[in-house]
Interface confidence: medium
C-alpha cells in the first residue's frame, strides 16, 4: 500500500509563437483544478478506460481574471498535492492522464460551469520510494509542468511497497536473516509472512499466508506468466507447463463492486459500472455531489445538492457514461467514404480525405483536371484521384513546364549523332545509314531500302525527326 503524489508546478502557455488566449475573461473570472487518473502498466489505454490504480481531484485554485491586451501567463494553481492512494503493490510501470479543468465563476444560470482546458497523458516507469520525478507535457498551446513520486505507507517498503518493516526489537541489530529497512535503518524487514513458495519477484502479500500476484502473473504462487496464446479453457489454458492460466475463479466472482455496482470482466481485470452517486475502481467512493465536479469532459451536473441525492451528468456530444467519462467512438461507424481517415475531435467528426476527394465525408469525387493546366500544349489525363499531364514533344515534368532533353534516350541508331532542336531532335546519320533515326541502311549500289529520298536531301544527310 502507498500513495502516488502529484505536484503541479505551473500551467500556462507553452513556448512558441501561438500564445493561447487567457481562459478567464474579465467578465467571467475562473479558477483551475486538476484531475489525475492512474492505470497500471505501459499499455496505450483509451482515456475513458477505468483509472484502475486510482484517481484524484485537486482543490480549486485562486480566482483569476484575465489581463486584457496580454498573453495568458502561467495561471494560479491550487495549493497542495494531488494524492492517489493505492492499496496493492505499486506496479512500477504506469500510465497517467492529467486533466486541467476550468471552473467559470460568472453569474450564469445554474452556478459554476466546468470545462476541460487541457489533457496530457504519458507512460512512465517509477520505483516507489524514489525521488520526485519532474516532467513537462504539452497539450496544444498549453504547457503543464509537474513532479510526481510514489511512496509506501508504513509498514510497507521497497520499490513496489511489497516488503514489510517493523520497529527493531533489539536496539543494536535486526534478528537473524533480517536486513535493516533502508532508508529506515532503525527498522527491520519483517519476517516472511507470505504463503510458502510465493514468488518474491511476482507475488506479494498484505496478510500472513496469502500470495497475491503482480500484473502479468498468475497461479497459486504467482509463478505462471499470463499467456496471451490460445488456450482451451474459457479463461485460458490449464497447464502450468504451457504458461497458461489455470482455470479458477474469475475476476468478477464474488462481485468485487460495492454499493450495487455491476461487474464485467476485461482482458486484464474487471470493470465496475457504478450506480449514480458512487465511483472508484470498486464503486467504493460515495457522497459525491455536483460541488465535487463529478462530470468530466464538459458534462453538465444537475441535482445532487447533498450527498443523499443523486446527481446526473448531461454529457456533451461525443461522451457518455454516468460521469461523461467514456468517449463515444463515432469513427467505428466508418463515416468517411472513399478511404478517408476519420478523426474524432470530441466536439466534431472530421474526415481527412484522400487526394481527389472532398466534402465533409469525402463523398465528392473531384474532377482531377479541373483548374489544372498542363503547360506547353500538354493535355490533362484524369486518374485515381490525381491528375497527370501528357506532355507535348520536348516537354516533361508534372505540369509539362520542364523542357525535356530529346537526346537523353539516345534515339539515333547506328552511331548517328543527336542534336536537340527547338521542335524536337535531329539525327546526323553515320555513313551508310539514313532515316529519321538513322534506322535504315543504305544499299551498296546506292539504292536505299526506302523510297527515294525527298527532294533536297541526299541519302546520308541528317534527317530531321518531327
Amino acid at each position: 500500500a502507498g500513495v502516488f503524489e502529484l505536484q503541479i508546478h505551473s500551467f500556462g502557455p507553452g513556448p512558441g509563437p501561438g500564445a493561447p488566449r487567457s481562459p478567464c475573461s474579465a467578465r467571467l473570472p475562473c479558477r483551475l483544478f486538476f484531475r489525475v487518473c492512474l492505470k497500471p502498466g505501459l499499455s496505450e489505454e483509451a482515456a475513458e478506460s477505468p483509472c484502475a490504480l486510482g484517481a484524484a481531484l485537486s482543490a480549486r485554485g485562486p480566482v483569476y481574471t484575465e489581463q486584457p491586451g496580454a498573453p495568458a501567463p502561467d495561471l494560479p494553481l491550487p495549493d497542495g498535492l494531488l494524492q492517489v492512494p493505492f492499496r496493492d503493490a505499486w506496479p512500477g510501470t504506469f500510465s497517467f492522464i492529467i486533466e486541467t479543468w476550468r471552473e467559470e465563476l460568472g453569474d450564469q444560470i445554474g452556478g459554476p460551469a466546468w470545462s476541460l482546458l487541457a489533457r496530457v497523458a504519458g507512460r512512465r516507469r517509477l520505483a516507489a520510494g524514489g525521488p520526485w520525478a519532474r516532467d513537462i507535457q504539452r497539450a496544444g498551446a498549453w504547457e503543464l509542468r509537474f513532479s510526481y513520486r510514489a511512496r509506501c505507507e508504513p509498514p510497507a517498503v521497497g520499490t513496489a511497497c511489497t516488503r514489510l518493516c517493523r520497529p527493531r526489537s533489539a536496539p543494536s541489530r535486526c534478528g537473524p536473516g533480517l536486513r535493516p529497512c533502508a532508508p529506515l535503518e532503525d527498522e527491520c524487514e519483517a519476517p516472511l509472512v507470505c504463503r510458502a513458495g510465493c514468488s518474491p519477484e511476482h507475488g506479494f502479500c498484505e496478510q500472513p499466508g496469502e500470495c497475491r500476484c503482480l500484473e502479468g502473473w498468475t497461479g497459486p504462487l504467482c509463478t505462471v506468466p499470463v499467456s496471451t496464446s490460445s488456450c482451451l479453457s474459457p479463461r485460458g489454458p490449464s497447464s502450468a507447463t504451457t504458461g497458461c492460466l489455470v482455470p479458477g475463479p474469475g475476476p468478477c466472482d464474488g462481485n468485487p463492486c460495492a454499493n450495487g455496482g455491476s461487474c464485467s470482466e476485461t482482458p486484464r481485470s474487471f470493470e465496475c459500472t457504478c450506480p449514480r452517486g458512487f465511483y472508484g475502481l470498486r464503486c467504493e467512493v460515495s457522497g459525491v455531489t455536483c460541488a465535487d465536479g463529478p462530470c468530466f469532459n464538459g458534462g453538465l451536473c444537475v441535482g445532487g445538492a447533498d450527498p443523499d441525492s443523486a446527481y446526473i451528468c448531461h454529457c456533451p456530444p461525443g461522451f457518455q457514461g454516468s460521469n461523461c467519462e467514456k468517449r463515444v467512438d463515432r469513427c467505428s461507424l466508418q463515416p468517411c467514404r472513399n478511404g478517408g481517415l476519420c478523426l474524432d475531435l470530441g466536439h466534431a467528426l472530421r474526415c481527412r480525405c484522400r487526394a481527389g476527394f472532398a466534402g465533409p465525408r469525402c463523398e465528392h469525387d473531384l474532377d482531377d483536371c479541373a483548374g489544372r493546366a498542363c503547360a506547353n500544349g500538354g493535355t490533362c489525363v484524369e486518374g485515381g484521384g490525381a491528375h497527370r499531364c501528357s506532355c507535348a514533344l520536348g516537354f516533361g515534368g508534372r505540369d509539362c513546364r520542364e523542357r525535356a532533353d530529346p537526346c537523353a534516350a539516345r534515339p539515333c541508331a547506328h552511331g548517328g549523332r543527336c542534336y536537340a532542336h527547338f521542335s524536337g531532335l535531329v539525327c546526323a546519320c553515320a555513313p551508310g545509314y539514313m532515316g529519321a533515326r538513322c534506322e535504315f541502311p543504305v544499299h551498296p549500289d546506292g539504292a536505299s531500302a526506302l523510297p527515294a529520298a525527298p527532294p533536297g536531301l541526299r541519302p546520308g544527310d541528317p534527317q530531321r525527326y518531327l
Epitope: 500564445a19 489581463q67 498573453p71
Partner: antibody, heavy 124, light 108 residues
C-alpha cells in the same frame, strides 16, 4: 541590463506622419512573453498609453487613436516602430518606449523599464 | 474606458510626515492589475508599486500600497526629501489601459 532608446524627427508639421523608433538591448523580442509598448506624455501632464506589441506579433492599440497608429517590430535588429498619421499640435509630447515586464507571483504584466523618451513637437 | 482620478493634484508634506495619495477608479479594477509609477522632473517614470501592494525593486520600505475595487492608495509612512516627485496610478485591468493625471508631491 535592459536599455531602450527612442528616436524621432523632433519637429514636424500638422498632417504629416510621425515615425518613431525604439532601439533596445538586453533582451530579444523573439523570446516568448516579451513585449514593448509606447506611452506619451504631453508637457507637464499625465501619461497616455498608445500601443504595445508582443513577441508573437499580437498588437494592441488605444481605441481613441487606433485609426492613426501602426506599431511594428524588426526582431532581428531589436527595434520597434510606431507611426502616427495626420499629426496635430495635440500630438506634441514626450514619447516613451517601455519594456513590458512580468510579475510571476501575481500572474500580471506591467510597464517595467522605460526609455528616456524623445520629444516631438508638432508646429506649423 | 476606466477613468482614474488622483487626489490631491498637488500636495506638500514635511519630512517625517505620513502621506496618503489616493486613486479612485470610475469602475472596478482588479487589484492584481493596479500599479503606481514615480516620476521626477526631466526623467522617465519608474515602476514603484505593482499589483496594488508590492514594492518594485529598490523602493524604500516606507512606501506601501493598498486598496481594492474602485479605491486605491499609496502611503508613505514618513516623508523624506527624495520622495518629492509626481506619482501616477495606472490600471491594466480593463481595455484601454489608462493612467491617472498624477499627484505632485512636494517637500514642505
Amino acid at each position: 541590463q535592459v536599455t531602450l532608446k527612442e528616436s524621432g524627427p523632433g519637429i514636424l508639421q500638422p498632417s504629416q506622419t510621425l515615425s518613431l523608433t525604439c532601439s533596445f538591448s538586453g533582451f530579444s523580442l523573439s523570446t516568448s512573453n516579451t513585449g514593448i509598448g509606447w506611452i506619451r506624455q504631453p508637457s507637464g501632464t499625465g501619461l497616455e498609453w498608445l500601443a504595445h506589441i508582443w513577441w508573437n506579433d499580437d498588437k494592441y492599440y488605444n481605441p481613441s487613436l487606433k485609426s492613426r497608429l501602426t506599431i511594428s517590430k524588426e526582431t532581428s535588429n531589436n527595434q520597434v516602430f510606431l507611426k502616427i498619421t495626420n499629426v496635430d499640435t495635440a500630438d506634441t509630447a514626450s514619447y516613451f518606449c517601455v519594456q513590458i515586464g512580468r510579475d510571476y507571483s501575481n500572474y500580471a504584466w506591467y510597464f517595467d523599464v522605460w526609455g528616456a523618451g524623445t520629444t516631438v513637437t508638432v508646429s506649423s | 474606458q476606466i477613468v482614474l482620478t488622483q487626489s490631491p493634484a498637488i500636495m506638500s508634506a514635511s519630512p517625517g510626515e505620513k502621506v496618503t495619495l489616493t486613486c479612485s477608479a470610475s469602475s472596478s479594477v482588479s487589484s492584481r492589475y493596479l500599479y503606481w509609477y514615480q516620476q521626477k522632473p526631466g526623467s522617465s517614470p519608474k515602476l514603484w508599486i505593482y499589483s496594488t501592494s508590492n514594492l518594485a525593486s529598490g523602493v524604500p520600505a516606507r512606501f506601501s500600497g493598498s486598496g481594492s475595487g474602485t479605491s486605491y492608495s499609496l502611503i508613505i509612512s514618513s516623508m523624506e526629501a527624495e520622495d518629492a516627485a509626481s506619482y501616477f496610478c495606472h490600471q491594466w485591468s480593463n481595455y484601454p489601459l489608462t493612467f491617472g493625471a498624477g499627484t505632485k508631491l512636494e517637500l514642505k
